[in-house]
């Protein structure tokens, strides 16, 4: 999906009033100092892109974030206010709930989160770019 | 606890160069960016720039290039200002300060370190 | 760059007055508007972000709202810790800017 024509400015207010409260709670106890970011993104469109594939793809440590309640918001998010985005998740939702598995926050779901959490750090303020 | 520990002030030359530090602790440096922030005494705040310590990535106010270079040393967790040809008028008070959690503000700052320019 | 135009420059308060700044942007800045206060030998403290999102810890009393180019800080009953210089500032477009600030004084 091309993130080029979303309402960056309503999904940053969406992340701002809640998906950001709910990745803090996933993180919560967690040492400020235990991971670096590692994943990184250049403009809005990149930044959404990278936060899809790190919220809803499975990986291996780490199979169950698109469960979890801010996946979810984001989801919402994207839906509303990226045209055409519900149409090209019908397929990977339906995968989804082949494979859906319990609930379980491992260290590599955490340092996920904390990637996300700089990925949408870069996505409301996009650093380099004369925005 | 998170804390941007500055360097001490400086009474320096016109004509000369001069580099404040900022040390980091209590975060993973590289995950947020550090600004720094002007003030002139009595006077409000002047944005100078912002860099990313995990790449280097910098952008600059216009008033400032020039005048000042930001650098990052990961390997200390500092972040770094210089600013050249000085002048009477970059006589003031030099804050760095970390992005917050969202992105959208200024979360921790240092304590300031007054530079003094004069003959 | 945007100009934050910030009023008044001076406020005389007493303890438990309300007190209402204002912040006006020069372009729309969308809700990417941020307010610090500044104690006198102090560096600044963040209070509200995003427009009317509270910082951790700080007090109920402080809000913040507006939108676009118009925007405005309130204390709803000041203490008298509150005195110190109130700024605003724009996080939408590079340069970054900042309001002139206004000092709020003991009548």
């Known amino acids: 999906y091309d993130f080029t024509n979303c309402d960056f400015e309503k999904i940053k207010a969406a992340y701002l009033s809640t998906i950001s409260k709910d990745l803090i709670t996933y993180m919560s106890g967690t040492k400020s100092t235990e991971f670096n970011n590692t994943v990184s993104c250049s403009n809005r469109p990149h930044c959404l892109t990278e936060i899809q594939s790190l919220t809803f793809n499975p990986t291996a440590g780490c199979a169950s974030l698109a469960k979890e309640m801010f996946a979810m918001k984001t989801k919402a998010a994207l839906a509303i206010w990226c045209p055409g985005y519900s149409e090209t998740q019908i397929n990977a939702t339906q995968a989804m709930k082949k494979r859906r598995k319990r609930k379980v926050t491992t260290n590599k779901c955490l340092e996920q989160v904390s990637q996300l959490q700089g990925l949408w750090r870069r996505f409301n303020r996009p650093l380099l770019k004369q925005q | 606890q998170v804390q941007l520990q500055q360097s001490g002030a400086e009474l320096v030359r016109p004509g000369t160069s001069v580099k404040v530090s900022c040390k980091a602790s209590?975060?993973?440096?590289?995950?947020?960016?550090i600004e720094w922030v002007k003030q002139r005494p009595g006077q409000g705040l002047e944005w100078i720039g912002v860099i990313d310590p995990g790449n280097g990535d910098t952008n600059y106010n216009e008033n400032f290039k020039g005048k000042a270079t930001l650098t990052a040393d990961k390997s200390s967790s500092t972040a770094y200002i210089e600013l050249s040809r000085l002048t009477s008028e970059d006589s003031a008070v030099y804050f760095c300060?970390?992005?917050?959690?969202?992105?959208?503000?200024?979360?921790?700052w240092g304590q300031g370190t007054t530079l003094t320019v004069s003959s | 760059s945007i100009v934050m135009t910030q009023t008044p420059k001076f406020l005389l308060v007493s303890a438990g007055d309300r007190v209402t700044i204002s912040c006006k942007a020069s372009q729309s800045v969308s809700s990417d508007v941020t307010w610090y206060q500044q104690k006198p030998g102090q560096s600044p403290k963040l209070l509200i972000y995003?427009?009317?999102n509270h910082y951790t810890g700080v007090p109920d009393r402080f809000t913040g709202s507006g939108y676009g180019t118009d925007f405005t800080f309130t204390i709803s009953s000041v203490q008298a810790e509150d005195l110190a210089v109130y700024f605003c500032?724009?996080?939408?477009?590079?340069?970054?800017?900042f309001g002139a600030g206004t000092k709020l004084e003991l009548k």
């Open positions: 300060a970390r992005e917050d959690n969202t992105g959208t503000a200024f979360d921790y």
């Open positions: 500032q724009q996080h939408h477009r590079f340069p970054l800017t």
């Open positions: 995003y427009v009317s």
């Open positions: 209590g975060y993973a440096f590289t995950n947020y960016l």
